[in-house]
Structure formats: C-alpha cells, structure tokens
Amino acid sequence: NQDLPVIKCVLINHKNNDSSVGKSSSYPMVSESPEDLGCALRPQSSGTVYEAAAVEVDVSASITLQVLVDAPGNISCLWVFKHSSLNCQPHFDLQNRGVVSMVILKMTETQAGEYLLFIQSEATNYTILFTVSIRNTLLYTLRRPYFRKMENQDALVCISESVPEPIVEWVLCDSQGESCKEESPAVVKKEEKVLHELFGTDIRCCARNELGRECTRLFTIDLNQTPQTTLPQLFLKVGEPLWIRCKAVHVNHGFGLTWELENKALEEGNYFEMSTYSTNRTMIRILFAFVSSVARNDTGYYTCSSSKHPSQSALVTIVEKGFINATNSSEDYEIDQYEEFCFSVRFKAYPQIRCTWTFSRKSFPCEQKGLDNGYSISKFCNHKHQPGEYIFHAENDDAQFTKMFTLNIRRKPQVLAEASASQASCFSDGYPLPSWTWKKCSDKSPNCTEEITEGVWNRKANRKVFGQWVSSSTLNMSEAIKGFLVKCCAYNSLGTSCETILLNSPGPFPFIQDNIS
C-alpha cells in the first residue's frame, strides 16, 4: 500500500539510574544501542495495525519503546496502557522522521502488558502494538559445568545445562600456585566448548549467564609434584561424570602411566592417554580416568602409577546427596579496638557452596579458598570493628548451613543520659559490660563522692542492636535528691565514663559529660 508510512520500532535498554514510574518522553536518557523490534503489519486486523516483536524485560530494568515514522507532515499520537491514556509528545529527528517514545523506568509487574500507540498522520491513521513482559527469572538456572570426551577426538567438551544458555569458557594456566589466580597474566581464557590442549597445569571450565558464574576444575594428580600431606579427595553425586587426570613429565618417553581402582586396573574404555613434548624436550604424558555416570561402587582409592615416578592416589567418594560439613555452634569473640581479626568458617562441602556474610541486615560477598586437606575456608575481615552479630550462610543444591558469630570490641564505656520528672537513666555500650555507680553532688560533697544506693535499678544487656549489648541504669527520683546534681558512672576494666544530671530542673536537662580513664 503506497499510503502506508515507513515505520521502525526499536527497544532501547538503559543503564539504571532513576526510579520514576513509566512515562511518555520525547527525549529518552543515554542508553545502550537500540534493538530493532521489527514492526510487521498484523494480518486480518481491522484497520492498520503494526505489531512489534515481544519485549522481555528484567525486573527493575529501564527501557524505552520507540517508534520512528517516516511520513510527510505532522503527526499526533496517543499511548494507551491498561485502558488509561498516556500523554504522547512526538518530535522530529535530524532525518525529519517522527519519533515517539515511551520510557519505562524500573520495570515492575504492574508495568507489564500491552502498550498501544495510536498515530494520526496527514495521510492515514494506524496503531502500533507493543507487548512487554517481565522475564521469568524463576525458570533460570546455572548448573556447574561437567566434562565429556569428544567423540573420536582427544578433546574435552564442557557442558553446563543452564537457562538461559550460558557462555562457556576454558580457563587455563601453566604456572604453579598463586600465579594461577583468575586475573593473573599466566591465565589464558578460551571462550569455546571444546578443548584440545589438555596438557596444562591447571584446567577449569566456567559457565556464566544472568545468574552468575560457576566453574569446575579438572581434578589432576601431578606425579612431579610433592604429594599433599592429606590424600586429595574428590566428591561426586551418583550419576555425575568422573574425570581424573594423571600428569607426569620425564626426561624422555621411556615411561608409562597406569590407573588402578583399589589395586585393580581400570577397565578399557575408562581411561585414555595422551603425550607431547614440553620444554627441554621433556615428555609430558597424561592419563585420564573417566566414568560417564558414577555409581556407588565407583567409590575408592584411584592410584596413578608410573614406571619412573612415585605413585599417587586420590580418594573418590560417591554420595547420594550433596552436603555441607562444618561446626554450626555459635562463636563469640572479643577483640581490642584496633586489633586485626577475621571470622573464619572451615567446611567440607559438595557441590561447591554459594555463601554470604551478613551483619546488620547487610550482606557482604563471600570468598572461599580450598585448603590442601580437602576442606575449604571462608574468611570475613570487613567488620570495621563494629560489635554485633555476624552470620555466615552457605548453601548448595542439597544442603544449607548457618553459623552465628558475636563480635565484642573491648572499649571504655561511653555514657548517654536522659531524665524525666520521675527518674534519670544512663546508657552505655562499652565492653566488657560496665557496672554502675550513682553519686550525689551537694555542699557536703562538692566532688560528688556521696554514693546513692537507694532507688537504683540496673539492667544489663536489655537492648540488643544487631547483637550489640547495651547496659542501662535508672535512678528513681526521691525527695532526698530532688534539685540536686547527680552523677552516673559506668566502669569496666578499660576505664570509667560519667555523666552529670541536674534533677528536676525545668526545660531540657543539661547533661555534663565527664570522662575519667
């Protein structure tokens, strides 16, 4: 149809920096590159209706729906969403095309639905339909990658059964120890599913999607390395694939490798060998032991032997269900104000855990480090010497674990006072929890040495602020002390702090703080 305008519908994804509700706008904010939504004429519809490709948006994401109209003359427009009309302000771009935009900021469930744009031009009227839905992240999964041998090739395929489909990458390192940290120059990343170079020192495969990143390391016994003090242990769940690589380097090719499970040679089809020359013409041999789907009877000691190296073993344990083993008893610590200190949890878990440290309803990232003995450790040092309750939470597909810590900071009491017509109260958060004394200041006792024992009520730790204990002491008013200055003092092993209060004075109570070490 010659009369129909040329229209283009685009989606613009924004970096979030606003929290307004959806609004029609002629000048959207700075954004990512636009994505063409097609906008095809809808067949068998009354009138001219264009339909844009369906738009899926993450919760809290900000987007702009935009229509570019290449038609002569002016245009007027109207947005309709859930039977409500929304203001529409077209403008013209440098190519003199009409531009109509709908900005949706911080996408929520209520903003999902059909957006109808009615456009009236000098020549014709037409409607554009956008369907916006929230991406269902509940269906998203990120599974730890696993290995398979490539059919008829000496290569490993890395597989992660995740939704949306993850990006798979191999992370390779030929160095030893610390230099194989993720961002080290010794680390090489290959964004592909198949790996042919299987001789490296450290081989990991990682899968990442919107939910994060999960990695699996190729379990390796290196016969040229000094064995760990404790036997390396590999856990697997029934049905998972087993891959162990045995690696050995020798001055020449006159050596061979063999795998045994509990002193019996592995069956053919459960291992394969590769060899290549390394630096100084030394020979590297690697021997893989693999089981495509493990059963309980695959548990045991796998030993790699060489005719030119001492044998080394690994204990493979097949479990029905994942686990997290750690002591969950709560732990209390008291430290000085400037003492360096980290909380730490030592655990053994399979599959690998996801974890968080929480303090004062705020979560902190959790790092885990593998130890030589098969255990892992997570440390938290970022407490900034704030006393209170810290929580370590860990979970994997099959298990959950929570451990509580209390941190007390040894310090001299700090006293706060308040008074009413009938009583005066003092509060302190020092640690160890302070003891209290009340003193009356009078002509007979200008230095406030006359102790008050009547009408004093001490409450220790009556208020728990994120695990931080507060101690208070209250003095009930009596005729004997009305109109006098009184002094409350909190003291512990680190010092004393006092506050002076004028009882029964009109208006706001003057408090005089008095620090005594």
Partner: antibody, heavy 119, light 113 residues
Framework: QVQLVQSGAEVKKPGASVKVSCKAS????????MHWVRQAPGQGLEWMGI????????TYAQKFQGRVTMTRDTSTSTVYMELSSLRSEDTAVYYC????????????WGQGTMVTVSS | DIVMTQSPDSLAVSLGERATINCKSS????????????LAWYQQKPGQPPKLLIY???TRESGVPDRFSGSGSGTDFTLTISSLQAEDVAVYYC?????????FGQGTKLEIK
Amino acid sequence: QVQLVQSGAEVKKPGASVKVSCKASGYTFTSYYMHWVRQAPGQGLEWMGIINPSSGSTTYAQKFQGRVTMTRDTSTSTVYMELSSLRSEDTAVYYCARSVGATSAFDIWGQGTMVTVSS
Amino acid sequence: DIVMTQSPDSLAVSLGERATINCKSSQSVLYSSNNENYLAWYQQKPGQPPKLLIYWASTRESGVPDRFSGSGSGTDFTLTISSLQAEDVAVYYCQQYYSLPVTFGQGTKLEIK
C-alpha cells in the same frame, strides 16, 4: 625389541575396500600414537592420518576423509587402517609408523604393505 | 597445510665428499613455547621403510652415524652428510610435525658420482 609388523600384500578391484593391520610389540601399545603413511610407486611419502591407541581418537588427512577408517584392538596391540572405494591411484605401499606425541617424529616404521588396485 | 619443498630433487656426490640437502617450509615450524623446530629427516633405501635420522631439526637419532647432521631454524633447514659413504645412497625426506596434517618434502635422491 620394538617392532611393528604389518599384514601381507593385497590385490583389490576398484570400488572395493582394503583393511591393513599393524601389530605392535616390545613397548606399551597405548602409550604411543600410530600414523599411517602411503607411498605410490616411485613417489614420495603421503600422510594419511593418526590414531591414539589409548582412546581410539583419530585425525585424518582431508584427502582421505570419508574413505579411511583407523581403529585399534588393545587386547592384541594392533591398529587397523581400512580404505574404501578403492581406485587405481590408491595402489601404493602403506606404512604404519609410531610417534611419541601426536606431533613428534616417527621413530619406528612397519615394513610396509603393498596394496594393488586393478580391474 | 604446511608445504615442504626440498632441493635439489637429485644429487650426485663423490664418495668421501660432503652432500647437502635443503628443505624449506611454507611457514615457520619453530614453536616459541619450547624453542624447538618440529622438523625431521628420514632416509629411505629401495624396498625398505623410511628410517628416522634427525629430529628437532638437529638431534641425531640413536644409532645414526655422526657424519649425518641437521641444521637450520624457522623455515630453512639443511641435512649434511660430511663424508659420503656407499651405504648412504638413498632417497632423503624432510618432514614437519609442527601441526597436523604432517607433511613431507618431495624427496631428494642421493647417488654416487
């Protein structure tokens, strides 16, 4: 001592297949790769492919892809090379040769098997 | 594929004289990671399989007489027989094993003058 012993000479008709064997002895069969190389009468050496006897994995030269199949039997320490759809230009001596790595020199060679393709 | 080109195609040298065969690869066969040239030389006598003489471009295989030597790096290589003996009459092949497919030179026929 280390040796590779190949099967005897074969005469085949065009379109037929031939399967040549190479039996290894004197070393650990699965610890070395095996290559197949052919040599037409009065011509040079032509690499056909490689097999890892440990895994059975193979890589073939593009020219022979789809016509050649290399297999192994670890119980008898033997590798096999089967060439199908034979034509007269496949008349050659076929050698198996051992190497330490996939990319290494060929240190031990079989004695060769003469395959004649003739109608 | 890496193309290997030998020169000359044939060579006649007097007994006791030096024989030199050249081999050129279409791309470098020097592997930077281990600084090795992935090049070998083979000797083939009539009715026999080839025999490995030199690997890593310059390392003599055990049992090979020391009159055979290899040199060169990258793309240009040489096999030298310092003093030709009657039993050295054969066809000599260079081979790259830097990458698959493995490729051979066309061969150089060495005869006695």
